[in-house]
Protein backbone atom coordinates (compact mmCIF):
# COMPACT_ATOMS: atom_id res chain seq x y z
CA UNK A 1 0.00 0.00 0.00
CA UNK A 2 1.22 3.53 -0.68
CA UNK A 3 2.26 5.92 2.06
CA UNK A 4 -0.88 7.85 1.28
CA UNK A 5 -0.19 10.80 3.57
CA UNK A 6 2.70 11.74 1.26
CA UNK A 7 0.81 10.95 -1.95
CA UNK A 8 -1.49 13.92 -1.58
CA UNK A 9 -1.77 17.42 -2.98
CA UNK A 10 -3.83 20.11 -1.37
CA UNK A 11 -6.96 21.06 -3.29
CA UNK A 12 -5.78 24.68 -3.32
CA UNK A 13 -3.08 23.75 -5.85
CA UNK A 14 -5.84 23.25 -8.41
CA UNK A 15 -8.00 26.20 -7.40
CA UNK A 16 -5.91 28.91 -9.05
CA UNK A 17 -7.95 30.07 -12.07
CA UNK A 18 -5.08 31.87 -13.80
CA UNK A 19 -2.60 28.98 -13.93
CA UNK A 20 -5.36 26.46 -14.62
CA UNK A 21 -6.42 28.57 -17.60
CA UNK A 22 -2.82 28.90 -18.84
CA UNK A 23 -2.31 25.12 -18.55
CA UNK A 24 -5.44 24.44 -20.58
CA UNK A 25 -4.50 27.08 -23.17
CA UNK A 26 -1.03 25.55 -23.55
CA UNK A 27 -2.62 22.14 -24.05
CA UNK A 28 -5.04 23.52 -26.62
CA UNK A 29 -2.31 25.26 -28.61
CA UNK A 30 -0.14 22.15 -28.67
CA UNK A 31 -3.05 19.90 -29.58
CA UNK A 32 -3.63 22.01 -32.70
CA UNK A 33 -0.11 21.00 -33.77
CA UNK A 34 -0.76 17.32 -32.98
CA UNK A 35 -1.65 15.41 -36.14
CA UNK A 36 -1.74 11.99 -34.47
CA UNK A 37 -5.22 11.91 -32.94
CA UNK A 38 -5.46 8.10 -32.86
CA UNK A 39 -3.11 7.79 -29.88
CA UNK A 40 -3.96 8.96 -26.37
CA UNK A 41 -1.24 8.94 -23.73
CA UNK A 42 -3.37 9.56 -20.64
CA UNK A 43 -6.18 7.05 -20.84
CA UNK A 44 -7.42 3.71 -19.60
CA UNK A 45 -4.26 1.77 -20.48
CA UNK A 46 -2.14 4.01 -18.27
CA UNK A 47 -4.26 3.21 -15.20
CA UNK A 48 -4.94 -0.46 -16.02
CA UNK A 49 -4.67 -2.61 -12.89
CA UNK A 50 -3.84 0.37 -10.67
CA UNK A 51 -5.86 0.74 -7.48
CA UNK A 52 -7.33 4.04 -6.28
CA UNK A 53 -4.67 4.36 -3.60
CA UNK A 54 -1.89 3.98 -6.19
CA UNK A 55 -3.16 6.48 -8.75
CA UNK A 56 -1.37 9.51 -7.33
CA UNK A 57 1.96 7.69 -7.27
CA UNK A 58 1.45 6.73 -10.91
CA UNK A 59 0.61 10.33 -11.83
CA UNK A 60 3.72 11.52 -10.02
CA UNK A 61 5.77 9.31 -12.36
CA UNK A 62 3.96 10.68 -15.41
CA UNK A 63 4.40 14.27 -14.22
CA UNK A 64 8.13 13.82 -13.63
CA UNK A 65 8.63 12.23 -17.06
CA UNK A 66 6.62 14.99 -18.74
CA UNK A 67 8.68 17.69 -17.05
CA UNK A 68 12.10 16.15 -17.62
CA UNK A 69 11.70 14.57 -21.04
CA UNK A 70 9.09 16.79 -22.69
CA UNK A 71 8.59 20.23 -21.17
CA UNK A 72 12.21 21.12 -20.36
CA UNK A 73 13.45 20.15 -23.86
CA UNK A 74 10.54 22.03 -25.48
CA UNK A 75 10.68 25.01 -23.12
CA UNK A 76 11.30 27.55 -25.88
CA UNK A 77 8.02 26.65 -27.64
CA UNK A 78 4.40 27.63 -27.03
CA UNK A 79 5.21 30.88 -25.29
CA UNK A 80 4.12 32.67 -23.16
CA UNK A 81 2.23 29.71 -21.66
CA UNK A 82 5.21 27.39 -21.29
CA UNK A 83 7.23 29.77 -19.07
CA UNK A 84 4.30 29.98 -16.63
CA UNK A 85 3.05 26.39 -16.68
CA UNK A 86 6.40 24.61 -16.30
CA UNK A 87 7.30 26.20 -12.93
CA UNK A 88 3.78 25.46 -11.68
CA UNK A 89 4.03 21.78 -12.62
CA UNK A 90 7.57 21.64 -11.20
CA UNK A 91 6.23 22.87 -7.85
CA UNK A 92 3.60 20.10 -7.88
CA UNK A 93 6.34 17.58 -8.66
CA UNK A 94 8.42 18.89 -5.76
CA UNK A 95 5.43 18.57 -3.40
CA UNK A 96 5.09 14.91 -4.44
CA UNK A 97 8.79 14.15 -3.94
CA UNK A 98 8.05 12.17 -0.76
CA UNK A 99 5.25 10.16 -2.40
CA UNK A 100 6.41 6.56 -2.52
CA UNK A 101 4.91 3.08 -2.55
CA UNK A 102 5.93 0.39 -0.12
CA UNK A 103 6.30 -2.92 -1.88
CA UNK A 104 5.92 -3.85 -5.52
CA UNK A 105 5.27 -1.08 -8.01
CA UNK A 106 6.23 -3.09 -11.08
CA UNK A 107 2.71 -2.89 -12.57
CA UNK A 108 2.80 0.90 -12.27
CA UNK A 109 6.30 1.20 -13.77
CA UNK A 110 5.19 -1.07 -16.64
CA UNK A 111 2.23 1.19 -17.44
CA UNK A 112 4.32 4.37 -17.22
CA UNK A 113 7.04 2.79 -19.37
CA UNK A 114 4.49 2.15 -22.13
CA UNK A 115 3.61 5.86 -22.10
CA UNK A 116 7.32 6.78 -22.20
CA UNK A 117 7.93 4.35 -25.07
CA UNK A 118 5.02 5.80 -27.05
CA UNK A 119 6.33 9.36 -26.64
CA UNK A 120 9.88 8.33 -27.57
CA UNK A 121 8.70 6.29 -30.57
CA UNK A 122 6.76 9.27 -31.94
CA UNK A 123 9.76 11.56 -31.49
CA UNK A 124 9.03 15.27 -31.50
CA UNK A 125 5.38 14.65 -32.40
CA UNK A 126 5.17 12.51 -29.26
CA UNK A 127 6.43 15.43 -27.20
CA UNK A 128 3.87 17.74 -28.83
CA UNK A 129 1.16 15.17 -28.05
CA UNK A 130 2.24 15.06 -24.39
CA UNK A 131 2.02 18.86 -24.20
CA UNK A 132 -1.38 18.69 -25.92
CA UNK A 133 -2.55 16.41 -23.12
CA UNK A 134 -1.45 18.69 -20.27
CA UNK A 135 -5.12 19.39 -19.56
CA UNK A 136 -5.64 15.65 -18.99
CA UNK A 137 -2.44 15.45 -16.94
CA UNK A 138 -3.61 18.39 -14.80
CA UNK A 139 -7.07 16.89 -14.24
CA UNK A 140 -5.82 13.34 -13.70
CA UNK A 141 -3.21 14.56 -11.23
CA UNK A 142 -5.90 16.51 -9.39
CA UNK A 143 -8.38 13.61 -9.35
CA UNK A 144 -5.74 11.13 -8.22
CA UNK A 145 -3.96 13.22 -5.61
CA UNK A 146 -6.40 15.53 -3.78
Amino acid sequence: APISSHCRLDKSNFQQPYITNRTFMLAKEASLADNNTDVRLIGEKLFHGVSMSERCYLMKQVLNFTLEEVLFPQSDRFQPYMQEVVPFLARLSNRLSTCHIEGDDLHIQRNVQKLKDTVKKLGESGEIKAIGELDLLFMSLRNACI
Epitope: A1, I42, V50, S53, M139, R142, N143
Partner: antibody, heavy 119, light 112 residues
Framework: EVQLVESGGGLVQPGGSLRLSCAVS????????MIWVRQAPGKGLEWIGI???????YYASWAKGRFTISRDNSKNTVYLQMNSLRAEDTAVYYC?????????????WGQGTLVTVSS | AVVLTQSPSSLSASVGDRVTITCQAS??????LAWYQQKPGKAPKLLIY???TLASGVPSRFSGSGSGTDFTLTISSLQPEDFATYYC??????????????FGGGTKVEIK
Protein backbone atom coordinates in the same frame (compact mmCIF):
# COMPACT_ATOMS: atom_id res chain seq x y z
CA GLU B 1 -16.87 -9.36 -25.78
CA VAL B 2 -17.15 -7.67 -22.38
CA GLN B 3 -20.26 -8.81 -20.50
CA LEU B 4 -21.73 -8.29 -17.04
CA VAL B 5 -24.68 -10.38 -15.88
CA GLU B 6 -26.50 -9.70 -12.61
CA SER B 7 -28.54 -12.35 -10.83
CA GLY B 8 -30.11 -13.03 -7.46
CA GLY B 9 -32.97 -10.56 -7.57
CA GLY B 10 -36.52 -11.43 -6.64
CA LEU B 11 -39.23 -10.91 -4.06
CA VAL B 12 -38.12 -10.50 -0.46
CA GLN B 13 -40.03 -9.54 2.69
CA PRO B 14 -39.25 -6.33 4.61
CA GLY B 15 -36.41 -6.97 7.05
CA GLY B 16 -35.08 -9.78 4.87
CA SER B 17 -31.72 -10.21 3.14
CA LEU B 18 -30.60 -10.88 -0.41
CA ARG B 19 -27.26 -11.40 -2.13
CA LEU B 20 -26.91 -10.24 -5.71
CA SER B 21 -24.20 -11.51 -8.03
CA CYS B 22 -22.52 -9.86 -11.00
CA ALA B 23 -20.70 -12.36 -13.21
CA VAL B 24 -18.23 -10.82 -15.65
CA SER B 25 -16.58 -12.12 -18.79
CA UNK B 26 -14.40 -10.76 -21.57
CA UNK B 27 -11.99 -8.93 -19.26
CA UNK B 28 -9.85 -9.56 -16.20
CA UNK B 29 -11.92 -8.66 -13.14
CA UNK B 30 -8.78 -8.35 -11.00
CA UNK B 31 -7.74 -5.27 -12.99
CA UNK B 32 -10.88 -3.20 -12.42
CA UNK B 33 -12.90 -1.57 -9.68
CA MET B 34 -16.61 -2.38 -9.88
CA ILE B 35 -19.67 -0.39 -8.85
CA TRP B 36 -23.29 -1.06 -7.95
CA VAL B 37 -26.05 1.37 -8.91
CA ARG B 38 -29.79 1.04 -8.39
CA GLN B 39 -32.90 2.50 -10.01
CA ALA B 40 -36.28 2.55 -8.29
CA PRO B 41 -39.27 2.12 -10.64
CA GLY B 42 -39.73 5.25 -12.73
CA LYS B 43 -36.87 7.02 -10.91
CA GLY B 44 -33.27 8.02 -11.60
CA LEU B 45 -29.95 6.31 -11.00
CA GLU B 46 -28.49 6.07 -7.49
CA TRP B 47 -24.92 5.04 -6.70
CA ILE B 48 -24.65 2.39 -3.97
CA GLY B 49 -20.95 1.68 -3.67
CA ILE B 50 -17.68 0.64 -5.26
CA UNK B 51 -15.12 -2.09 -4.65
CA UNK B 52 -11.57 -1.30 -5.69
CA UNK B 53 -8.99 -3.62 -7.23
CA UNK B 54 -7.42 -4.21 -3.81
CA UNK B 55 -10.77 -5.02 -2.20
CA UNK B 56 -11.26 -1.63 -0.53
CA UNK B 57 -14.92 -0.62 -0.45
CA TYR B 58 -16.65 2.76 -0.42
CA TYR B 59 -20.39 3.29 0.02
CA ALA B 60 -22.96 6.02 -0.36
CA SER B 61 -23.77 7.35 3.12
CA TRP B 62 -27.30 5.90 3.01
CA ALA B 63 -25.99 2.41 2.13
CA LYS B 64 -23.40 2.10 4.91
CA GLY B 65 -24.19 -0.63 7.40
CA ARG B 66 -26.88 -2.41 5.38
CA PHE B 67 -25.10 -3.04 2.07
CA THR B 68 -21.80 -4.87 1.59
CA ILE B 69 -19.86 -5.30 -1.66
CA SER B 70 -17.36 -8.12 -2.09
CA ARG B 71 -15.53 -9.76 -4.97
CA ASP B 72 -14.12 -13.16 -5.90
CA ASN B 73 -11.70 -12.66 -8.76
CA SER B 74 -11.22 -16.41 -9.18
CA LYS B 75 -14.94 -16.73 -9.92
CA ASN B 76 -15.06 -13.51 -11.96
CA THR B 77 -17.91 -12.36 -9.74
CA VAL B 78 -18.79 -9.31 -7.66
CA TYR B 79 -21.46 -9.48 -4.95
CA LEU B 80 -23.87 -7.11 -3.26
CA GLN B 81 -25.14 -8.29 0.11
CA MET B 82 -28.28 -6.41 1.19
CA ASN B 83 -29.63 -6.69 4.74
CA SER B 84 -32.61 -5.24 6.64
CA LEU B 85 -34.39 -4.57 3.38
CA ARG B 86 -37.17 -1.99 3.19
CA ALA B 87 -39.93 -1.25 0.68
CA GLU B 88 -37.92 1.73 -0.59
CA ASP B 89 -35.09 -0.62 -1.60
CA THR B 90 -37.33 -1.95 -4.39
CA ALA B 91 -35.36 -1.24 -7.56
CA VAL B 92 -33.43 -2.64 -10.49
CA TYR B 93 -29.84 -3.20 -9.33
CA TYR B 94 -27.02 -2.77 -11.84
CA CYS B 95 -23.32 -3.55 -11.66
CA UNK B 96 -20.87 -1.74 -13.89
CA UNK B 97 -17.16 -1.73 -14.57
CA UNK B 98 -15.25 1.33 -13.40
CA UNK B 99 -12.79 2.42 -16.07
CA UNK B 100 -10.46 5.07 -14.67
CA UNK B 101 -9.17 7.28 -17.48
CA UNK B 102 -8.06 10.10 -15.19
CA UNK B 103 -11.68 10.31 -14.10
CA UNK B 104 -13.98 7.40 -13.20
CA UNK B 105 -16.34 6.30 -15.97
CA UNK B 106 -18.78 3.42 -15.77
CA UNK B 107 -18.74 1.19 -18.82
CA UNK B 108 -20.24 -1.23 -19.59
CA TRP B 109 -23.24 -2.00 -17.37
CA GLY B 110 -25.05 -5.25 -16.74
CA GLN B 111 -28.69 -5.70 -17.74
CA GLY B 112 -29.84 -5.34 -14.12
CA THR B 113 -31.76 -7.53 -11.71
CA LEU B 114 -35.06 -6.53 -10.11
CA VAL B 115 -35.41 -6.61 -6.33
CA THR B 116 -38.91 -6.26 -4.90
CA VAL B 117 -39.31 -5.73 -1.17
CA SER B 118 -42.90 -6.42 -0.16
CA SER B 119 -44.93 -8.42 2.32
CA ALA C 1 -22.40 16.37 -1.62
CA VAL C 2 -22.66 17.82 -5.10
CA VAL C 3 -26.16 18.08 -6.56
CA LEU C 4 -26.70 17.80 -10.31
CA THR C 5 -29.78 19.52 -11.71
CA GLN C 6 -30.82 18.51 -15.21
CA SER C 7 -33.14 20.56 -17.36
CA PRO C 8 -35.57 20.08 -18.81
CA SER C 9 -36.82 16.95 -17.00
CA SER C 10 -38.53 15.96 -20.25
CA LEU C 11 -38.87 17.28 -23.79
CA SER C 12 -40.69 16.42 -26.99
CA ALA C 13 -38.82 16.59 -30.27
CA SER C 14 -39.00 15.36 -33.84
CA VAL C 15 -36.51 13.34 -35.89
CA GLY C 16 -33.92 15.76 -37.30
CA ASP C 17 -34.29 18.28 -34.47
CA ARG C 18 -31.34 19.71 -32.60
CA VAL C 19 -31.73 18.84 -28.93
CA THR C 20 -29.91 20.44 -26.00
CA ILE C 21 -29.93 19.15 -22.42
CA THR C 22 -28.25 21.02 -19.57
CA CYS C 23 -26.74 19.82 -16.31
CA GLN C 24 -25.87 22.23 -13.53
CA ALA C 25 -23.62 21.25 -10.63
CA SER C 26 -23.96 22.81 -7.18
CA UNK C 27 -20.17 23.15 -6.96
CA UNK C 28 -17.17 23.27 -9.30
CA UNK C 29 -16.57 19.79 -10.74
CA UNK C 30 -14.06 20.94 -13.39
CA UNK C 31 -14.60 18.57 -16.33
CA UNK C 32 -15.41 15.51 -14.21
CA LEU C 33 -18.74 14.94 -15.91
CA ALA C 34 -20.12 12.05 -17.97
CA TRP C 35 -23.37 11.56 -19.89
CA TYR C 36 -25.30 8.27 -20.14
CA GLN C 37 -28.19 7.20 -22.32
CA GLN C 38 -30.83 4.78 -21.05
CA LYS C 39 -33.58 3.22 -23.13
CA PRO C 40 -36.69 1.72 -21.46
CA GLY C 41 -35.94 -1.63 -19.84
CA LYS C 42 -32.24 -1.38 -20.71
CA ALA C 43 -29.05 -0.57 -18.85
CA PRO C 44 -27.43 2.88 -19.11
CA LYS C 45 -24.81 3.34 -21.82
CA LEU C 46 -21.83 5.68 -21.62
CA LEU C 47 -21.95 8.48 -24.20
CA ILE C 48 -19.49 11.18 -23.13
CA TYR C 49 -16.81 11.62 -20.47
CA UNK C 50 -14.41 14.43 -19.51
CA UNK C 51 -17.47 16.61 -20.29
CA UNK C 52 -16.74 16.54 -24.03
CA THR C 53 -14.93 13.31 -25.02
CA LEU C 54 -17.08 10.96 -27.08
CA ALA C 55 -17.04 7.35 -25.86
CA SER C 56 -16.03 4.64 -28.32
CA GLY C 57 -18.73 3.77 -30.86
CA VAL C 58 -20.95 6.76 -30.05
CA PRO C 59 -22.21 8.63 -33.14
CA SER C 60 -20.71 12.08 -33.78
CA ARG C 61 -24.14 13.74 -33.63
CA PHE C 62 -23.69 13.60 -29.85
CA SER C 63 -21.48 16.24 -28.29
CA GLY C 64 -20.79 17.58 -24.82
CA SER C 65 -19.46 20.86 -23.56
CA GLY C 66 -18.89 22.83 -20.39
CA SER C 67 -16.69 22.92 -17.31
CA GLY C 68 -17.02 24.06 -13.73
CA THR C 69 -20.74 24.06 -12.96
CA ASP C 70 -22.53 24.28 -16.33
CA PHE C 71 -22.63 21.46 -18.85
CA THR C 72 -24.52 20.70 -22.04
CA LEU C 73 -25.31 17.57 -24.03
CA THR C 74 -26.29 18.27 -27.64
CA ILE C 75 -27.76 15.93 -30.23
CA SER C 76 -27.26 17.75 -33.54
CA SER C 77 -29.88 15.83 -35.51
CA LEU C 78 -32.17 13.58 -33.50
CA GLN C 79 -32.53 10.04 -34.81
CA PRO C 80 -35.32 7.52 -34.01
CA GLU C 81 -32.93 5.49 -31.81
CA ASP C 82 -32.08 8.57 -29.70
CA PHE C 83 -35.46 8.69 -27.93
CA ALA C 84 -34.37 7.75 -24.40
CA THR C 85 -33.56 9.18 -20.98
CA TYR C 86 -30.22 10.96 -20.55
CA TYR C 87 -28.34 11.25 -17.25
CA CYS C 88 -25.35 13.38 -16.30
CA UNK C 89 -22.97 11.98 -13.70
CA UNK C 90 -20.23 13.70 -11.72
CA UNK C 91 -17.13 12.48 -9.91
CA UNK C 92 -16.11 14.60 -6.94
CA UNK C 93 -12.65 13.91 -5.52
CA UNK C 94 -10.99 15.07 -2.33
CA UNK C 95 -14.13 14.96 -0.23
CA UNK C 96 -15.59 12.03 1.65
CA UNK C 97 -15.72 8.93 -0.59
CA UNK C 98 -19.37 8.41 0.34
CA UNK C 99 -20.40 11.22 -2.01
CA UNK C 100 -17.87 10.70 -4.80
CA UNK C 101 -20.34 9.69 -7.53
CA UNK C 102 -23.60 11.54 -8.20
CA PHE C 103 -26.21 11.31 -10.95
CA GLY C 104 -28.54 13.98 -12.26
CA GLY C 105 -32.29 13.40 -12.21
CA GLY C 106 -32.48 12.55 -15.91
CA THR C 107 -34.02 14.10 -19.03
CA LYS C 108 -36.55 12.07 -21.00
CA VAL C 109 -36.51 12.77 -24.75
CA GLU C 110 -39.87 11.81 -26.24
CA ILE C 111 -41.30 11.77 -29.77
CA LYS C 112 -43.35 14.85 -30.62
Amino acid sequence: EVQLVESGGGLVQPGGSLRLSCAVSGFSLSSYAMIWVRQAPGKGLEWIGIIDIDGSTYYASWAKGRFTISRDNSKNTVYLQMNSLRAEDTAVYYCARDRFVGVDIFDPWGQGTLVTVSS
Amino acid sequence: AVVLTQSPSSLSASVGDRVTITCQASEDIYTNLAWYQQKPGKAPKLLIYWASTLASGVPSRFSGSGSGTDFTLTISSLQPEDFATYYCQACVYGNSADSRYTFGGGTKVEIK
